[in-house]
């Protein structure tokens, strides 16, 4: 009876999400393997988040709006482990917008989800950021490693979206 009611709840939750995400990829987790955590297909998952790499070249503002329409934000990177996971799926000759910007050009960087900007957990390439006119951040491959660079927000780039996993 308990299992039946849990399944009914799950199905109704799945139907609810189906209007936003036609297909979900779910895995069982939790100590009793009773919880399902899902990401939209074909997003990838890491820890409690889902990631989508957009190859459409757009400005930073349009990229953020594009993520927003999908219920996500441009990616906020919180740890080196998270960055290492993300970069496995990136092309080394491309650049991708992050959810990090400095709209006033005062070097007051801010994450799109209001996560406090912690200078101790940043992965800027050497010598970056280097221009107050370059107010948006990308991740790219340079000098044999992935790192961040400040660029012009209006210049079209690829981008990475991030959203919380859906639990059902």
């Amino acid at each position: 009876n308990f299992m039946y009611s849990k399944t009914v709840k799950r199905l109704s939750k799945l139907q609810e999400y189906q209007q936003y995400y036609p297909s979900l990829t779910c895995v069982m987790e939790g100590k009793d393997m009773e919880d399902w955590s899902c990401c939209p297909t074909p997003w990838t998952s890491f820890q409690s988040s889902c990631y989508f790499i957009s190859t459409v070249m757009q400005s930073w503002t349009k990229s953020q709006n594009n993520c927003s329409v999908m219920g996500a934000d441009l990616v906020v990177i919180n740890t080196k482990e998270e960055q290492d996971f993300i970069t496995q799926n990136l092309k080394i000759n491309s650049a991708y917008f992050l959810g990090l910007s400095d709209p006033k050009g005062w070097r007051h960087w801010q994450w799109v989800d209001q996560t406090p900007y912690n200078k101790n957990v940043t992965f800027w390439h050497s010598g970056e950021p280097n221009s107050p006119d370059e107010r948006c951040a990308i991740i790219n491959f340079r000098s044999e490693e992935w790192g961040w660079n400040d660029v012009h927000c209006h210049v079209p780039q690829k981008s990475i979206c991030k959203m919380k996993k859906i639990y059902i």
Partner: antibody, heavy 121, light 111 residues
Framework: EVQLVESGGGLVKPGGSLRLSCAAS????????MSWVRQAPGKGLEWVST????????YYPDSVKGRFTISRDNAKNSLYLQMNSLRAEDTAVYYC??????????????WGQGTTVTVSS | DIVLTQSPASLAVSPGQRATITCRAS??????????MHWYQQKPGQPPKLLIY???NLESGVPARFSGSGSGTDFTLTINPVEAEDTANYYC?????????FGGGTKVEIK
């Protein structure tokens, strides 16, 4: 006082080349992105190319891509536009303009007086 | 590319009256309260001159009779009251994404 002075315009045959220059003074040239904007006779404004302050970024519309090259010499406070394979439709007054960044975009806060390019056989 | 459509193409206004020019973008040029639309004035034989930046900010030295408003896709430049020296072409320009684009212009004549 900010000043932008263009030169190098003239009459050229189709397929020919010209190099426009823009001499900047009255501001720290190396700190600003710069653009070329043109205006065909009796027509509106059309952006032609942009170069970032540090020379790391250049951008062109499809109409001139591969034919025009923007460059700058910060030591000489000068902006250039090399125009090759010129066509009749490139006939216009060419303005150099300074970019001032605002939030996620920019605007053109100072313009030169322009130099006239005529492409005709 | 973002297309900017200005209207009207031309208008004649009596001195002391109000002139209103609109600029419609093919997609939003606003983001979180910042509106990346700018206005320029161009008098015959002269280069363009910046009037208004970011939809509503008056450039230094520009008379207060010029004002701008709008957000998203719809923007307005207002001259009130119009003076004889305002005879010119007026252009809007967006910069939220490359390439930067200009409207087709509006010719303002003083009756």
């Amino acid at each position: 006082e900010v000043q932008l002075v263009e030169s190098g315009g003239g009459l050229v045959k189709p397929g020919g080349s010209l190099r426009l220059s823009c001499a900047a003074s009255g501001f720290t040239f190396s700190s600003y992105g710069m653009s070329w904007v043109r205006q065909a006779p009796g027509k509106g404004l059309e952006w032609v190319s942009t170069i970032s302050s540090g020379d790391s970024y250049t951008y062109y519309p499809d109409s001139v891509k591969g034919r025009f090259t923007i460059s700058r010499d910060n030591a000489k406070n000068s902006l250039y536009l090399q125009m090759n394979s010129l066509r009749a439709e490139d006939t216009a007054v060419y303005y150099c303009a300074r970019q001032l960044y605002y939030s996620y975009g920019y605007y053109f806060d100072y313009w030169g007086q322009g130099t006239t390019v005529t492409v005709s056989s | 590319d973002i297309v900017l459509t200005q209207s009207p193409a031309s208008l004649a206004v009596s001195p002391g009256q109000r002139a209103t020019i609109t600029c419609r973008a093919s997609e939003s040029v606003s983001f979180h309260g910042t509106h990346l639309m700018h206005w320029y004035q161009q008098k015959p034989g002269q280069p363009p001159k910046l009037l208004i930046y970011a939809a509503s900010n008056l450039e230094s030295g520009v008379p207060a009779r010029f004002s701008g408003s709008g957000s998203g896709t719809d923007f307005t430049l207002t001259i009130n009251p119009v003076e004889a020296e305002d005879t010119a072409n007026y252009y809007c320009q967006q910069s939220i994404e490359d390439p930067p684009t200009f409207g087709g212009g509006t010719k303002v004549e003083i009756k």
